[in-house]
């Protein structure tokens, strides 16, 4: 028997520095977690102790903190090289700055293979990107070889900016011929490494003949065997075992997100490359693991540019940006409108001639808006200003919901109106009218939504049975502020871009902003 140790990360999202337990900015260092310096310590410890070790990343290193905003992926290549990753799969967020924003900082600079079997380049891009990412890579591990085959969510064109010259194929259809090819190359130990979410990971384990292990990402799935060491609740045991259609037991793993854990999976193969046994658990990278001093010094060196960036002007406002709780928790506020407009703008994807855009709606809990911005400071808006407005380090995500769920959400928005509570919704692409004289749960008297399948966008009444795409904070997607109906009833959830980054990009693009209060949210009494 031959033993392989797979160390894996996914959805690190720019958490190069250690973070607090909830993966936001580290405040009390003695209780902070993750970060590449701490990760390196643990990886090196395992590499020294065990003979056959692979360090893999399942995508979405890009996007999530000011590190990505400033360094645009150069930080990913630099620190992943320093940690000596063996392979990485492309995630949807790797395309956030377009194909060029992937090629130049990451693909050309990475010293490790970057993989995806289901992304096919066409047109002029095909020759430009040729060889910079691969469908698979055969890695030597001691005297054995291990094949790593990559995959990426086929939803990427709706979630990011891959452009028109990349085709995202069905994962299973694309993976099978590559795995077959590996078999003909005498490679009998094959890992599928990819970024399509836990459900697709399980399907790949079930359907792709010849895949021995699946290492996934995208859904931030936490798996654990035994008592979990922190706040994350396991979605299943680690590894999660899937019985393939040809009767094999295939371990599937994921390691939550944000570099908080290092996935640790030990696989025992027989001499024919069959998995005999698999066991392990994610390792919580808490403060009991010291940060590696040389990596930490490098982080501190790179940090300097970030501090300079946060005080630079992004754009100007010529109006007061009202982000006060007195406004945003009670009525339409122009800060809410600005943020929602930025959220929609960030999700403009013309992927179908029938649709002007794939999504038109935004909702945002008023309690998530934490500060106004005064225009009487020469109108200047900085990253620092935005960090005061959106201090929680969240993301603006894409969900699919039925109209009936949206109606419940808007009823929840005003079910205890008047107590300055955070669940009051700010909106974009939605016109809502409330009648507060009615009983809670029956206060939404009009709810019109902006069409997407139209050449001239206009507002139509919400249909209860229709499925709508909505952009909202991850906080709401996870049921925060009492929006349990969103968490329970959502049909799809894809994590999006860092909240501050979305708004800062929009302001930089617009240069001068003047959001108004324009009647998106209205109150009435009496009949309609």
């Amino acid at each position: 028997a031959w033993e392989l140790t797979i160390l894996h990360t996914n959805d690190v999202h720019s958490r190069l520095e250690q973070t607090s337990e909830d993966s936001s900015k580290c405040v009390n260092a003695s209780r902070c977690m993750g970060g590449v310096a701490r990760l390196f310590t643990k990886v090196q410890q395992i590499r020294r102790a065990e003979p056959n070790v692979l360090l893999l990343d399942a995508g979405d290193q890009y996007q999530g903190t000011i590190w990505f905003t400033v360094y645009k992926g150069a930080e990913v290549a630099h620190f992943m090289n320093a940690l000596r990753y063996d392979a990485m799969a492309l995630g949807n967020h790797e395309f956030d700055n377009g194909v060029e924003g992937l090629i130049e900082p990451l693909l050309k600079e990475a010293k490790f293979p970057i993989l995806s079997a289901n992304i096919k380049a066409k047109g002029p891009l095909a020759s430009q990107i040729s060889g910079l990412y691969l469908p698979y890579k055969v890695l030597p591990v001691g005297d054995e070889v291990v094949g790593i085959v990559g995959y990426t969510s086929k939803e990427t064109p709706f979630l990011s900016n891959p452009g028109t010259n990349l085709v995202f194929e069905d994962e299973i259809t694309a993976l099978q011929p590559e795995v077959d090819k590996l078999k003909t190359l005498n490679v009998n130990k094959i890992i599928a490494l990819g970024h399509s979410g836990f459900e697709m990971d399980k399907l790949i384990a079930q359907k792709v003949r010849g895949v021995d292990v699946v290492v996934g990402g995208h859904s931030n799935t936490f798996l654990y065997t035994g008592n979990p060491p922190s706040k994350e609740v396991p979605a299943g045991k680690y590894p999660f075992i899937v019985t393939s259609d040809d009767g094999r037991k295939v371990p599937v793993v994921q390691a939550y997100a944000f570099g908080k854990y290092l996935g640790y999976l030990k696989i025992e193969f027989d001499e024919r490359g069959n998995v005999i046994s698999s066991h392990g658990n994610p390792i919580l990278l808490n403060s009991s693991i010291p940060e590696d001093p040389s990596i930490k010094a490098d982080i501190n060196k790179w940090r300097i540019k970030l501090d300079n960036y946060s005080t630079q002007e992004l754009g100007k406002t010529i109006v007061y940006l009202d982000g006060s709780s007195q406004s945003c928790r009670f009525r339409e506020c122009n800060m809410g409108n600005l943020i929602c407009d930025a959220m929609i703008n960030n999700n403009l994807r013309h992927t179908d001639e029938m649709f002007w855009n794939h999504v038109s709606m935004c909702i945002l809990n008023g309690g998530g808006i934490r500060s106004p911005i005064d225009e009487r400071n020469n109108g200047t808006i900085t990253w620092e200003n935005l960090a005061a407005v959106l201090p929680f380090g969240g993301t603006f995500d894409l969900v699919q919901l039925k109209g009936s769920t949206l109606k419940k959400a808007f009823e929840h928005s005003v079910h205890r109106y008047g107590q300055s509570t955070g669940e009051f919704l700010q909106v974009g692409g939605i016109h809502v009218v409330y009648d507060l004289s009615r009983k809670p749960g029956d206060r939404v008297v009009k709810l019109d939504v902006l069409c997407t399948k139209c050449r001239v966008p206009s507002y139509d009444p919400l249909k209860m049975d229709e499925v709508y795409k909505v952009i909202l904070p991850n906080f709401l997607a996870n049921g925060g502020d009492g929006f349990q109906m969103i968490k329970d009833e959502l049909l799809r959830h894809d994590s999006g871009d860092q909240d501050i980054n979305v708004v800062s990009t929009y302001i930089s693009k617009m240069k001068v902003i003047y959001p108004a209060v324009e009647g998106r949210i209205k109150f009435s009494t009496g009949s309609h």
Epitope: F112, K183, L185, N186
Partner: antibody, heavy 115, light 108 residues
Framework: QVQLLQSGAEVKKPGASVKVSCEAS????????ITWVRQAPGQGLEWMGW????????NYAQKFQDRVTMTTDTSTSTAYMEVRNLKSDDTAVYYC????????WGQGTLVTVSS | EIVLTQSPSSLSASVGDRVTISCQAS??????LNWYQQKPGKAPKLLIY???NLQTGVPSRFSGSGSGTDFTFTISSLQPEDIATYYC??????????FGQGTKVDIK
């Protein structure tokens, strides 16, 4: 333990062919490819090609593409390499090695091409 | 095809000396590099795999480092039995491989 046993030395005339064998033992033959490397007298090591023992798939170095054929016989766990149209500068020791890690080598087969 | 350039092509050193051999790749090969020792009339012996990992049973005076395009092989304290030719070999693109031209090491 892993062993690769190669056939004995050969003397050939220019234009002739030679077939070198490499018999594997101590492991499952079909689990690892076989690599062939040669070394001319006083010269360095030269990678010639690789064959999959799984299905006979071959990858040859450009230089040997049209003169070399690699084959396997899984029933006897043996790999073969044939070099055709021999020239005097094909005089070399020919080695087989297991897989891609090259931790296990045959003892070498000296092929002398002389008129 | 990736070309490996080894230097020096030969060297003489005294017993106990530190010996360093360099290997430069024409394109980046991550850490996919092996080092071999070959004594006259013998098959090559794998010393270092993946640029820096010592093969089982190989004395710890042998070490390797590097990544990307520049690699180094070191014998920390040369012993009489280390007289041999040393080769680097890259395996960036399975199952292809290429060797450096070799460095002959002898004792002064």
């Amino acid at each position: 333990q892993v062993q690769l046993l190669q056939s004995g030395a050969e003397v050939k005339k220019p234009g002739a062919s030679v077939k070198v064998s490499c018999e594997a033992s101590g492991y499952t033959f079909t689990n690892y490819g076989i690599t062939w490397v040669r070394q001319a007298p006083g010269q360095g090591l030269e990678w010639m090609g690789w064959i999959s023992t799984y299905n006979g798939n071959t990858n040859y170095a450009q230089k040997f593409q049209d003169r070399v054929t690699m084959t396997t016989d899984t029933s006897t766990s043996t790999a073969y390499m044939e070099v055709r149209n021999l020239k005097s500068d094909d005089t070399a020791v020919y080695y087989c090695a297991r897989g891609w890690g090259f931790a296990h080598w045959g003892q070498g087969t000296l092929v002398t091409v002389s008129s | 095809e990736i070309v490996l350039t080894q230097s020096p092509s030969s060297l003489s050193a005294s017993v106990g000396d530190r010996v360093t051999i360099s290997c430069q790749a024409s394109d980046k090969i991550n850490n996919y590099l092996n080092w071999y020792q070959q004594k006259p009339g013998k098959a090559p012996k794998l010393l270092i795999y993946d640029a820096s990992n010592l093969q089982t049973g190989v004395p710890s005076r042998f070490s390797g480092s590097g990544s990307g395009t520049d690699f180094t092989f070191t014998i920390s304290s040369l012993q009489p039995e280390d007289i041999a030719t040393y080769y680097c070999q890259q395996y960036n693109s399975y199952p292809y491989a290429t060797f450096g031209q070799g460095t002959k090491v002898d004792i002064k």
